[in-house]
Interface confidence: low
């Protein structure tokens, strides 16, 4: 039993939460809260929006983003892309891992131009030591942050 | 190998399924089937809609609800909130853990006023012994139950 | 530590990805890539679209499908069903495990008839040795494949 509990305590896991500083508008990935409230890191590191593996293996990685807006302006891309991407020293470019495309602003109802939608991604990927995973949303102007419960990013070793 | 198998058999996990009694209309959380069909509890308890931790640690908790309706009546909130909430003796109020907002009834198609939508939530949270997690949906009148496969609630320790 | 690492390396897990051959049009389940790119099998087998358990226990199974289309033609079902189903020698028919219904083609916006939607399913189910899990989508003509990141299917033992 002691062996089993120790195993759980050492199993890499993390849950990062959305914060006011998450949306940079710089074209970079979303940034995350790592310590306050529900956020934590256990056996994984964090760097500039990225979860960084300290131990090689298969990880279930996940992210949810809360989308919302008022109406569907003509100038706005009708397709929103939410994805998890890997950064590795072995490639110069980010590698797509898990991606969703949605058309949320078509969801405004006839009696309310306000719309909300949510995108969830989760899947198992292999990470080597030092490899990083980031979250990107295009168009990030549609991500709605509040208190860390609606947009988040996490992982655990399986 | 025996050590590893025992570890898996002891790892807390649960999957609860939607049933006719899930929707109470009382303003409380959704209630769940714990034994029949696909439902089970292993190392977690259940009480009045809540999964109760018997062992402290980090858990991946998840819920899916099937939403559906006909048209988008004016009297109906155009925003549906689906959330996982923690009850703990340390706070008088429930704590939001993972939440989604959706505007599903804007999804009726031009040739059918019937619409369906699904909301999935999942993420890692810390639970102490005795802490509880519940599922709430507002407006719960839009939750469509059938056979336990479309709306459900579960957790496992990571 | 050696004990813990061995435990992780033996823990059954898989992530299968969408490919051009995934959609058969034959009424059967979706087929998947098992080796190339992000796809892998560890302690689980694959057969004709199915993940096959080699070890009895509780598994978190998941699938995401990327849906997309142009407009909402009258001839097309306005409800899309995405589900995970179990095949077992103990029953002649497939057993529904986790299912979602969505009405995605109502999401086309006014200035782009193109719409996208994504459906994610995940939950814990019990599998005996030799039992299989498959993914079905009705109408599968709306599944949009690209590079294995948008539609996928996986599992790991919990």
């Amino acid at each position: 039993l002691i062996q089993e509990r120790r195993s759980h305590q050492n199993n890499p896991a993390a849950h990062l939460t959305g914060a006011n500083s998450s949306l940079t508008g710089s074209g970079g990935p979303l940034l995350w809260e790592t310590q306050l409230g529900l956020a934590f890191l256990r056996g994984l590191d964090y760097h500039d929006g990225a979860l960084v593996a300290n131990k090689a293996g298969y990880y279930y990685i996940y992210s949810k983003v809360q989308l919302g807006g008022v109406g569907c302006p003509l100038g706005l891309a009708s397709t929103i892309t939410h994805g998890l991407y890997k950064r590795t020293p072995r490639y110069p470019e980010e590698l797509e891992l898990l991606v969703s495309q949605q058309s949320p602003c078509g969801r405004a109802t006839s009696n309310s131009r306000v719309w909300w939608d949510s995108s969830f991604l989760g899947g198992v990927v292999h990470l080597e030591v030092g490899e990083e995973v980031v979250v990107r949303v295009l168009d990030e102007r549609l991500v709605r942050l509040r208190d860390g419960t609606r947009s988040y990013f996490g992982a655990f070793m399986v | 190998l025996i050590q590893e198998r025992r570890s898996h058999q002891n790892n807390p996990a649960a999957h609860l399924t939607g049933a006719n009694s899930s929707l109470t209309g009382s303003g409380g959380p959704l209630l769940w089937e714990t034994q029949l069909g696909l439902a089970f509890l292993r190392g977690l308890d259940y009480h009045d809609g809540a999964l109760v931790a018997n062992k402290a640690g980090y858990y991946y908790i998840y819920s899916k609800v099937q939403l559906g309706g006909v048209g988008c009546p004016l009297g109906l909130a155009s925003t549906i909130t689906h959330g996982l909430y923690k009850r703990t003796p340390r706070y008088p109020e429930e704590l939001e853990l993972l939440v989604s907002q959706q505007s599903p009834c804007g999804r009726a198609t031009s040739n059918s006023r019937v619409w369906w939508d699904s909301s999935f939530l999942g993420g890692v949270v810390h639970l102490e012994v005795g802490e509880e997690v519940v599922v709430r949906v507002l407006d719960e009148r839009l939750v469509r139950l059938r056979d336990g496969t479309r709306s459900y609630f579960g957790a496992f320790m990571v | 530590l050696i004990q813990e690492r061995r435990s992780h390396q033996n823990n059954p897990a898989a992530h299968l990805t969408g490919a051009n051959s995934s959609l058969t049009g034959s009424g059967g389940p979706l087929l998947w890539e098992t080796q190339l790119g992000l796809a892998f099998l560890r302690g689980l087998d694959y057969h004709d679209g199915a993940l096959v358990a080699n070890k009895a226990g509780y598994y978190y199974i998941y699938s995401k499908v990327q849906l997309g289309g142009v407009g909402c033609p009258l001839g097309l079902a306005s409800t899309i069903t995405h589900g995970l189903y179990k095949r077992t020698p103990r029953y002649p028919e497939e057993l529904e495990l986790l299912v979602s219904q969505q009405s995605p083609c109502g999401r086309a916006t006014s200035n782009s008839r193109v719409w996208w939607d994504s459906s994610f399913l995940g939950g814990v189910v019990h599998l005996e040795v030799g039992e299989e899990v498959v993914v079905r989508v009705l109408d599968e003509r709306l599944v949009r494949l690209r590079d294995g990141t948008r539609s996928y299917f996986g599992a790991f033992m919990v």
Epitope: - | - | L74, A108, S112, R113
Partner: antibody, heavy 116, light 108 residues
Framework: QVLLVQSGAEVKKPGASVKVSCKAS????????INWVRQATGQGLEWMGW????????DYAQEFQGRVTMTRDTSISTAYMELSSLRSEDTAVYYC?????????WGQGTLVTVSS | SYELTQPPSVSVSPGQTARITCSGD??????AYWYQQKSGQAPVLVIY???KRPSGIPERFSGSSSGTMATLTISGAQVEDEADYYC???????????FGGGTKLTVL
Amino acid sequence: QVLLVQSGAEVKKPGASVKVSCKASGYTFTHFDINWVRQATGQGLEWMGWMNPDSDNTDYAQEFQGRVTMTRDTSISTAYMELSSLRSEDTAVYYCARGGTTLDYWGQGTLVTVSS
Amino acid sequence: SYELTQPPSVSVSPGQTARITCSGDALPKKYAYWYQQKSGQAPVLVIYEDSKRPSGIPERFSGSSSGTMATLTISGAQVEDEADYYCYSTDSSDNHVIFGGGTKLTVL
């Protein structure tokens, strides 16, 4: 900015075919439908159909079924509309327009004259 | 087949309010869209989804829809607003566009 630039005027004999091009710039060509609308001199607007550059899906107004073909070349962000079996009443200005149901940007128009 | 009906012509004096109507049986369920077309030019979108105004369109242009009737209103019409105005909507499948016959607005 968004621009739709159409090919120049055409004169055709009855029974012939005409192919009008529409080159798009200033946006992602595959994200929006291209619609075709025509207008005879002194008459109203008449919708002919749409083509989705991403999927190559098309849908034509019933009056043009069997005579019109809408295609595209995504490599040069250009849409085409070909009308066959021309008759004198097909004499009109032909417009391409971007969008699904909100046709928000239009080409300058191409005059097609059908005359023997 | 589905039709949209507009008055052939509307006349107003400069500064007056011009109202152009468009009627169709499906308008309770469908959005109305409005175009302005000046002589020899391509149409320009002035109202979409019943009442939304694209950027660059003056505030004097507004739209509304009630029951089977959609209305384009030009508050304080100006001489440069003289043009043909077309309403359009979609058929039951949302796959086909239907134009109204057009209304010639004269600002005397």
